[in-house]
């Protein structure tokens, strides 16, 4: 689970040992302060759970790229 | 310790309803769904729906969606399972079972309700 | 909807012995999203393995789980009298769409 260390900036300090798949993912951001220990993906869930994520993992990569292009496909 | 405590055995006409109760202790009820599983005697596991609370809205198995209802109430932790046009085939044992919503196995599991439609 | 067929229905084997057993899927189950329980008579389904390979809290590694795609397997490297059981497999992929194997009895020989 992410931690906010301020209003600003929520770190994660701990990532998800299991892949979720993406149709449980709704949307995600990228953590990249230089306040952070680690570079990290928080995953919004179709719960509204947030879980932090490897970036460098091949399964976060995929998500991530699958969740751009629901953004990008409008809904009929 | 997560617990599922379902309601007791039940005697039902044909035609009439019944609804079976399970109550959740020890976890959360927020990322979580209950599933409920039949199993008709000397038979195998049958899905029949599932809800996830914080969403209200439930799913079903095509085979009873019209005659199954499933609801939960997040207040009291406890979900419903609802079945009405009751025939002898429905004599089984229900079982609730947890799931967390990011997944999808059963981790925990009711101690089943013998619910049995006779005449 | 995708249907789960396990194979043999019953397996007749002594304790000390191997037990293969199998399920096949009628579609891709992706993500690997496929558990096994085990069920004694009385007894409600216990969950063994989740995501086709991952032993579930206080199951012993006698038992494994193996596969992807559409075929999947529950191994018991040596059976123990408390093993004879019912086995069945379970894959949920969808949330709105979960779906179960018919079972596969193990039986003492």
């Known amino acids: 689970q992410p931690d906010a260390i301020n209003a600003a900036v929520t770190c994660c300090y701990n990532f998800t040992n299991r892949k979720i798949s993406v149709q449980r993912l709704a949307s995600y951001r990228r953590i990249t302060s230089s306040k952070c220990p680690k570079e990290a993906v928080i995953f919004k869930t179709i719960v509204a759970k947030e879980i932090c994520a490897d970036p460098k993992q091949k399964w976060v990569q995929d998500s991530m790229d699958h969740l751009d292009k629901q953004i990008q496909t409008p809904k009929p | 310790q997560v617990q599922l405590v379902q309601s007791g055995a039940e005697v039902k006409k044909p035609g009439s309803s019944v609804k079976v109760s399970c109550k959740a202790s020890?976890?959360?009820?927020?990322?979580?769904?209950i599933s409920w599983v039949r199993q008709a005697p000397g038979q195998g596991l049958e899905w029949m729906g599932g809800?996830?609370?914080?969403?209200?809205?439930?799913n079903y198995a095509q085979k009873f969606q019209g005659r199954v209802t499933i609801t939960a109430d997040e207040s009291t932790s406890t979900a419903y399972m609802e079945l009405s046009s009751l025939r002898s085939e429905d004599t089984a044992v229900y079982y609730c079972?947890?799931?967390?919503?990011?997944?999808?196995?059963?981790?925990?599991w009711g101690q089943g309700t013998l619910v049995t439609v006779s005449s | 909807e995708i249907v789960l067929t396990q194979s043999p229905a019953t397996l007749s084997l002594s304790p000390g012995e191997r037990a293969t057993l199998s399920c096949r899927a009628s579609?891709?189950?992706?993500?690997?999203?496929l558990a096994w329980y085990q069920q004694k008579p009385g007894q409600a389904p216990r969950l063994l393995i989740y995501?086709?390979?991952d032993r579930a809290e206080g199951v012993p590694a006698r038992f494994s789980g193996s596969g992807s795609g559409t075929d999947f397997t529950l191994t018991i490297s040596s059976l123990e009298p408390e093993d004879f059981a019912v086995y069945y497999c379970?894959?949920?992929?969808?949330?709105?769409?979960?779906?179960f194997g018919q079972g596969t009895k193990v039986e003492i020989k």
């Open positions: 020890g976890g959360t009820f927020s990322h979580y769904g």
């Open positions: 809800v996830i609370p914080i969403f209200h809205t439930a």
């Open positions: 995501d086709a390979s």
């Open positions: 379970h894959q949920y992929i969808h949330l709105h769409s979960f779906t």
């Open positions: 579609q891709h189950v992706s993500d690997a999203y």
């Open positions: 079972a947890r799931y967390d919503a990011h997944y999808g196995e059963l981790d925990f």
